[in-house]
């Protein structure tokens, strides 16, 4: 999916209110020093799709991130705000229901909703730059 | 320390595929950053190719990105370059290299590769 | 696409002396800016990142300044180990990051 054609400020908007105290909760009791940042992006597009990948792509060593809250409002947010985005996420929804349903957080899960945390401030960051 | 390694064949035929690996040792793919691909010209600047992040994202240099496919074997700590329909103007040294998806901090020595008949 | 552009193509110094390398973009890339080196033979090596940041290991000899479409590296006393070719880039424009052309530092 093209991120290009997205409502930026709005989905800043959604961040801000929703998912980013979300990310927090879920990364609660570790400290932001506690993990390397070793990606990042360059402009607004670059964030979403690196934001999309990280979130919704299970990984051999945390696959259970779809399911959870920030996942589901980032999913609503993306579809809100980007046209066309949730005629192209049925691959996507399929991955959610394979995703395991243990609540156990790991500290690979941890390790990469910190990246994730990264990139949605760097989105943040490209926004400010651009205004 | 990280240390990458390409390697593949150093000569390739006009038309057909060029294929290339990079070895990673000293950290694993799947753990962070990014890996990617970086060409150079005899003689020439260096050109961007693509990437593949430790989550499994990819991103291509539009100008490549129809004959470019980069791919990665965790299980082996390794990442690889396919790039189609080469040409005399695909001839380079051929270099991957460890990214944050921006810049590249740590690269491979780098592997020639010919496109000639 | 972002075309950078370095200056001059070959810089021709003494050791001790002071190099001033000149990298531009056609439109801005913010801060998103990183430089290398590369030696005959070899890989290029990381040296400065955003613009101002040097990387793990790297000289405070090295030091980047620059925003915008206005970049410069400079090495405040050449040593003999710094007599190399240079190239700036740009990452601000994802997916079409690009590289200068490339400045040669030699010896005079």
């Known amino acids: 999916y093209d991120f290009t054609n997205c409502d930026f400020q709005k989905i800043e908007a959604d961040y801000l209110r929703t998912i980013s105290k979300d990310l927090i909760t879920y990364m609660s009791g570790t400290k932001s020093t506690d993990f390397n940042n070793t990606v990042s992006c360059s402009n607004r597009p670059h964030c979403l799709t690196e934001i999309q990948s990280l979130t919704f792509n299970p990984t051999p060593r945390c696959a259970s991130l779809a399911k959870e809250m920030f996942a589901r409002k980032t999913k609503a947010t993306l579809a809100l705000w980007c046209p066309g985005y949730s005629e192209t996420q049925i691959n996507a929804t399929q991955a959610m229901k394979k995703a395991r349903k243990s609540k156990v957080t790991t500290n690979k899960c941890l390790e990469q909703v910190s990246q994730l945390l990264g990139l949605w401030r760097r989105f943040i960051r490209t926004l400010l730059k651009k205004q | 320390q990280v240390q990458l390694q390409e390697s593949g064949p150093g000569l390739v035929k006009p038309s057909e595929t060029l294929s290339l690996t990079c070895a990673v040792s000293g950290y694993s793919i799947s753990s962070g950053y990014g890996w990617s691909w970086i060409r150079q010209p005899p003689g020439k600047g260096l050109e961007w190719i693509g990437y593949i992040s430790y989550y499994g994202s990819t991103s291509y240099n539009p100008s490549l990105k129809s004959r470019v496919t980069i791919s990665r074997d965790t299980s082996k700590n390794q990442f690889s370059l396919k790039l189609s329909s080469v040409t005399a103007a695909d001839t380079a040294v051929y270099y991957c290299?460890?990214?944050?998806?921006?810049?590249?901090?740590?690269w491979g020595q780098g592997t020639l590769v010919t496109v000639s008949s | 696409e972002i075309v950078m552009t370095q200056s001059p193509a070959t810089l021709s110094l003494s050791p001790g002396e002071r190099a001033t390398l000149s990298c531009r973009a056609s439109q801005s890339v913010s801060s998103y800016l990183a430089w290398y080196q590369q030696k005959p033979g070899q890989a290029p090596r990381l040296l400065i990142y955003d613009t101002s940041s040097r990387a793990t290991g790297i000289p405070a000899r090295f030091s980047g300044s620059g925003s915008g479409t206005d970049f410069t590296l400079t090495i405040s006393s050449l040593e003999p180990e710094d007599f190399a070719v240079y190239y700036c880039q740009q990452y601000s424009n994802w997916p079409q990051y690009s590289f200068g052309q490339g400045t040669k530092v030699e010896i005079k």
């Open positions: 290299a460890r990214t944050n998806l921006l810049y590249f901090d740590s």
